[in-house]
C-alpha cells in the first residue's frame, strides 16, 4: 500500500514528539525533597528538564544518562511563623540526555549508584 506524504509526516511528527528525551516539567519542591508539611515554598513548583516519552518496547524504560544541577532561589516559609518568607537556594536535578534502557539495566544502574 502507498501512503500519502501527509499521513507519513503526521506519523513521523508524533513519533518524534513522543520519543524518549528531556522534557520541561514542573516539579513540586516540597514533594521532590520530602520536606515537612509545615514548610512551604513560594513558588511551590520549579521548571526543570526530566526524561520522559515512549520507548518502542515494553521492556524498555526512558532513563536519564546525564544530569546537570540547576540552582534556583525560592522563598521558604515555615510554620510557626517565627520569621517571614526567607530566600533559599536549592539545587535541582536537570536531565540533559536520555536513553531507552532495559528494566534490568535500570535496576543495575540504580543499585550501582546505591553501592557507590
Amino acid at each position: 500500500a502507498h501512503y500519502n506524504t501527509e499521513i507519513l509526516k503526521s506519523i513521523d511528527n508524533e513519533w518524534r514528539k513522543t520519543q524518549c528525551m528531556p522534557r520541561e516539567v514542573c516539579i513540586d519542591v516540597g514533594k521532590e525533597f520530602g520536606v515537612a508539611t509545615n514548610t512551604f515554598f513560594k513558588p511551590p513548583c520549579v521548571s526543570v528538564y526530566r526524561c520522559g516519552g515512549c520507548c518502542n518496547s515494553e521492556g524498555l524504560q526512558c532513563m536519564n544518562t546525564s544530569t546537570s544541577y540547576l540552582s534556583k532561589t525560592l522563598f521558604e516559609i515555615t510554620v510557626p511563623l517565627s520569621q517571614g518568607p526567607k530566600p533559599v537556594t536549592i539545587s535541582f536535578a536537570n536531565h540533559t540526555s536520555c536513553r531507552c534502557m532495559s528494566k534490568l539495566d535500570v535496576y543495575r544502574q540504580v543499585h550501582s549508584i546505591i553501592r557507590r
Partner: antibody
Framework: EVQLLESGGGLVQPGGSLRLSCAAS????????MSWVRQAPGKGLEWVSA????????YYADSVKGRFTISRDNSKNTLYLQMNSLRAEDTAVYYC??????????????WGQGTLVTVSS | QSVLTQPPSASGTPGQRVTISCSGS????????VSWYQQLPGTAPKLLIY???HRPSGVPDRFSGSKSGTSASLAISGLRSEDEADYYC???????????FGGGTKLT
Amino acid sequence: EVQLLESGGGLVQPGGSLRLSCAASGFTFSSYDMSWVRQAPGKGLEWVSAISYDNGSTYYADSVKGRFTISRDNSKNTLYLQMNSLRAEDTAVYYCARDPYLARLNTFDYWGQGTLVTVSS
Amino acid sequence: QSVLTQPPSASGTPGQRVTISCSGSSSNIGSNNVSWYQQLPGTAPKLLIYYNSHRPSGVPDRFSGSKSGTSASLAISGLRSEDEADYYCATWDSSLNGYVFGGGTKLT
C-alpha cells in the same frame, strides 16, 4: 516594627473613582503577598482583592470584579487599589493586610488601621 | 450571606470557656488552612490563630483553634472582660478563587 498605613479614602459620588494606597514599612515588602479587606459600617469583614508578592497574580471578589484594580510597586513598598464605578454599597473602611503566602497559609498577620471610603451623592 | 457560617453571638462569664464554630464546605475549610481574627470595638482586626491551630507570638494560650473536616472552631478559656470583641474565621475558597470570611461572632 511592621507598619501598614492606608490613605486615599474620602467622600465620592456614585460612579466616581478613588485610589487607595497602603505604605508598608518594617519588613521586606517584596516577599509578601498583600490583600485589601473592607468592612461596611456595622457589618462584618469582606475580602476585596489580593496580589502576589511579584505582581504575577491578582484575585478579586465577585462584588468588585471589573471595577477595582489591585497593584503594587515593590520599589516604593506600596500597595494600591484603584476603585472605579463606585456604588453606595462600596462604602466601608478599607484595610490593607499582609499575607505570608496567598492561598496556602491563608492568614493576614498584620493589618493597617484602615481608611474610610464613603460613596454618596 | 457569608460563605462561612458563624453564630452571630456568644456569651460567657469571667473564667468560663466558650467555643465559636465556623462551618464551611469542601472547597474552603475542607481543603484549606483556617485563620481566626479578633476585632475589638473601633480597631483593626488582629490575627489570633493561623494554620488552623497556631498562635502568633503575643497571643495568650487561652486561645486555641482546631479544624475537623469542613468545620473549624475557636475556644477561649478563662474568659476575661477584655475578650469582649467580634471574632471572625477566614480561609481560601478554591472554587471562588478568593478569600472568604465568616459573618463574625459578637462575644459578650
